[in-house]
Interface confidence: low
């Protein structure tokens, strides 16, 4: 629609002409109110009703009416009229878009005298060269300080020309700034290159903390170096407190590994625990990742400059949604070995696990599994069942993570997957498993133990058998006998000793001929049915000097049951005062039927068991 022919917008007394009003209708965009802007600011463009009937002057229009003018409609106005519009917009505090501000600035070709009357943010779009005198530039940049520099992106030409002009205006030479200089620069201080950060860290770092956008690479490196240097205002990282961490909040993503490692660890922990409870650190609900990472959770874009280029300590300061948005799953997979050295929270580990789950829905490759570290504790048995773990090094690495804790369902599943994959419990595997879980062998069923090859028995230590029951030792003993068969007597006994709970009578008899000096603890673990047939002489030879220990054990199995089977005069030869043997003239009947039924041998002798008096009188025998 064409603009009305040139007529003054306002009459001399401030009464607008009809043509001017029509212009306003178009120039203020009432035909097409700016929905975008209304949505962003919460302001709405007003309807047209009543404006034609009672035409107002610009200053009498409400903010809602002034809201959305298209640039094209301003281009035909004189500089004076544009100035009047700009002043009205300032008076009504109307929030303008970047395009509208740029448009107005472009039409204000001459430098305005009354800068204070113009919208503050409009100044950002004016050419600073137009305010070259010392007074003019001071007035201009004093106002700019209060403007929202971040309306302009870092790379925008209007923003790039402001900083050098401001530095020149304030008379800054070199890179050394005073506190007053930083204050005078306002939001432009966030654009100062790294050399300023390096030379003026004391006054500049506290300002950079509150810069809304991310710092560029040059600034980050300079800030990192300054913080690591330990100069004022924060001092050496080793002396930082929780309040220092709070003060540094905006610079935390800049910290590198050496700085983080130097901060008192208790301080990092305390600060992070506190900030995790601080609502101001939480993202609005719509972007929070639910614990189970439901598919419908809205994906949030990674903030500019936060994309992770490597897995390092700076990530501990990322919120959960930032980790989700800014860490590439493939990068994580290739640098998994670093995760274990970084103190992520449990919640952050959940996010990392979720990323790996998405990357490897069929199960993780072994290259990733080997470096899971503490992330392994986040895995469920269901996750682990998808894995194909073949390397003993991988198994060791994951068992190391759970070291010192009970065997968890995850570990049990991992071991099961590994052993099934190998087909049998070979020596190296057994060695590894028993090193981490001494009771592992005794947790297997006799059927499972039958798959252990004799060669693996070399890896078993005495403590690995502490919790094994006789049924398990019955399976393991023949394998041990086979494994150690080529050893000489004393060496053989040392190795076979802890397996003897599965040894038969004939093997115990054979051992008694070899001066082995079995200790009482081993004797007490022997099978009762294997001990009962041994003679007093055989037991004496078997135990050697340890035979004296029988007295202390005479009430306990298998010693108690063995005593009941021996002739009292034979027991007396030991000189230990063992009581309960069969007196001379008594007969022992082996009621094997009753033994089979009751599971215990039936001894016919004095004491609590059935006895039969044979009364073998010498005369009768004669």
């Amino acid at each position: 629609m064409a603009l009305p022919t040139a007529r003054p917008l306002l009459g001399s007394c401030g009464t607008p002409a009809l043509g001017s009003l029509l212009f306003l209708l178009f120039s203020l965009g009432w035909v097409q109110p700016s929905r975008t802007l209304a949505g962003e600011t919460g302001q709405e463009a007003a309807p047209l009703d009543g404006v034609l009937a009672n035409p107002p002057n610009i200053s009498s229009l409400s903010p809602r009416q002034l809201l959305g003018f298209p640039c094209a409609e301003v281009s035909g106005l004189s500089t004076e009229r544009v100035r009047e519009l700009a002043v009205a917009l300032a008076q009504k505090n109307v929030k303008l878009s970047t395009e509208q501000l740029r448009c107005l600035a472009h039409r204000l070709s001459e430098p305005p005298e009354d800068l204070d009357a113009l919208p503050l943010d409009l100044l950002l779009f004016l050419n600073p060269d137009a305010f070259s005198g010392p007074q003019a530039c001071t007035r201009f940049f004093s106002r700019i300080t209060k403007a929202n520099v971040d309306l302009l992106p870092r790379g925008a030409p209007e923003r790039q020309r402001l900083l050098p002009a401001a530095l020149a205006c304030w008379g800054v030479r070199g890179s050394l700034l005073s506190e007053a200089d930083v204050r005078a620069l306002g939001g432009l201080a966030c654009d100062l290159p790294g050399r300023f950060v390096a030379e003026s860290a004391e006054v500049l770092l506290p300002r950079l903390v509150s810069c809304p956008g991310p710092l560029d690479q040059d600034q980050q490196e300079a800030a990192r170096a300054a913080l690591q240097g330990g100069g004022p205002p924060y001092g050496p990282p080793s002396t930082w407190s929780v309040s220092t961490m709070d003060a540094l909040r905006g610079l935390l993503p800049v910290l590198g590994q050496p700085i983080i490692r130097s901060i008192p660890q208790g301080i990092v922990a305390a600060w992070r625990q506190r900030s995790s409870r601080d609502p101001s650190w939480r993202q609005p609900e719509r972007t929070i990742l639910r614990p189970r990472f439901r598919r419908e959770v809205e994906k949030t874009a990674c903030p500019s400059g936060k994309k992770a280029r490597e897995i390092d300590e700076s990530l501990i300061f990322y919120k959960k949604w930032e980790l989700e948005a800014c860490v590439d799953a493939a990068l994580l997979a290739t640098q998994m070995d670093r995760v274990n050295a970084i103190p992520f929270t449990y919640e952050q580990l959940d996010v990392l696990k979720h990323k790996l789950d998405e990357l490897y829905p069929q199960g993780y490759p072994e290259s990733v599994i080997q470096h899971l570290g503490y992330l392994f504790l986040k895995m469920s048995p269901e996750d682990i069942r998808k894995w194909n773990v073949t390397s003993l090094e991988t198994l060791k690495a994951l068992l190391e993570v759970n070291k010192g804790h009970e065997m968890s369902p995850q570990v049990a599943t991992l071991i099961d997957r590994f052993v099934k994959g190998r087909g049998q419990l070979d020596k190296d595997t057994l060695d590894t498993l028993t090193a981490f879980y001494p009771g592992y062998l005794c947790s297997l069923s006799p059927e499972e133990l039958s798959s252990v090859p004799p060669s693996s028995i070399w890896a078993v230590r005495p403590q690995d058998l502490d919790t094994c029951d006789p049924r398990q030792l019955d399976v393991l003993y023949p394998k041990a006998r086979l494994a150690f068969q080529n050893m000489n007597g004393s060496e053989y006994f040392v190795k076979i000793q802890s397996f003897l709970g599965g040894a038969p009578t004939e093997d115990l008899k054979a051992l008694s001929q070899q001066n082995v000096s079995m200790d009482l603890a081993t004797f007490m673990k022997l099978r009762t049915d294997a001990v009962l047939p041994l003679t007093v002489a055989e037991v004496q030879k078997l135990l050697g000097p340890h035979v004296e220990g029988l007295k202390a054990e005479e009430r306990h199995r298998p010693v108690r049951d063995w005593i009941l089977r021996q002739r009292q005069d034979d027991l007396d030869t030991l000189g230990l005062g063992l009581q309960g043997g069969i007196p001379n003239g008594y007969l022992v009947l082996d009621l094997s039927m009753q033994e089979a039924l009751s599971g215990t041998p039936c001894l016919l002798g004095p004491g609590p068991v059935l006895t039969v008096l044979a009364l073998l009188l010498a005369s009768t025998l004669a």
């Epitope: 050496p236 080793s238 002396t239 590994q257 050496p258 490692r261 130097s262 008192p264 660890q265 208790g266 301080i267 922990a269 305390a270 274990n340 050295a341 090094e393 060791k396 690495a397 190391e400 993570v401 010192g404």
Partner: antibody
């Protein structure tokens, strides 16, 4: 089993140098931070230096900073302490120790980033005397 | 620098008795970063407790640790003959990276 064996100790004159070694076995050496702790005769334990598992971070006690250098060779499962400009007050038994990966007690924050020393060698004696 | 002060310097007790050892820090130490070690003559130290209260692998349950902030305690509920030794506390959570207390000697009365 897990074992650390120190070597390289001996009698040395003030101002001279000595290099201690610590051979590790029975665990994945490259996964653990390692350190040196010393104990002068009849005195308390004194931390000397630590090195991170991948050798990128090294930290020293003030008393040895600038004179001692901690290093490691993960391919050889060996930790080293190069001691230069030795002084009489450096006389002590030097223990090699492993930083164990332990959980802290908080449920929110797994504090496995910083460690206590969970495995120690038997020590090697360094005597600095003229 | 955090200084750890252990008291008493020497504790004379009989087997079967309860031992209570104190470790006081010059400034607050996160309980997650306090450890206790046992050292017998001619031997290397042995880790007993880390995280102020968590027993290291293989340590009998008669040993227990407690405390937070600046005051920490190691308790041996019933002294066994093998428990007579020197006990050190250590913080590993602030700069310098580690500091040890000067020890409490538990001797047979």
């Amino acid at each position: 089993q897990v074992q650390l064996v120190e070597s390289g100790g001996g009698v040395v004159q003030p101002g001279r140098s000595l290099r201690l070694s610590c051979a590790a076995s029975g665990f994945t050496f490259s996964s653990y931070g390692m350190g040196w702790v010393r104990q002068a005769p009849g005195k308390c334990l004194e931390w000397v230096a630590v090195i991170s598992y991948e050798a990128s971070n090294k930290y020293y006690a003030e008393a040895v900073k600038g004179r001692f250098t901690i290093s490691r060779d993960n391919s050889k499962n060996t930790l080293y302490l190069q001691m230069n400009s030795l002084r009489a007050e450096d006389t002590a038994v030097y223990y090699c120790a492993r930083e164990g990966a332990h959980f802290g007690s908080g449920s929110y924050y797994p504090l496995y980033y910083y460690y206590a020393m969970d495995v120690w060698g038997q020590g090697t004696t360094v005597t600095v005397s003229s | 620098e955090i200084v750890l002060t252990q008291s008493p310097g020497t504790l004379s007790l009989s087997p079967g008795e309860r031992a209570t050892l104190s470790c006081r820090a010059s400034q607050s130490v996160s309980s997650s970063y306090l450890a206790w070690y046992q050292q017998k003559p001619g031997q290397a130290p042995r880790l007993l407790i880390y995280g102020a209260s968590i027993r290291a692998t293989g340590i009998p349950d008669r040993f227990s640790g407690s405390g937070s902030g600046t005051d920490f305690t190691l308790t041996i509920s019933r002294l066994e003959p093998e428990d007579f030794a020197v006990y050190y506390c250590q913080q590993y959570g602030s700069s310098p990276i580690f500091t040890f207390g000067c020890g409490t000697k538990v001797e047979i009365k």
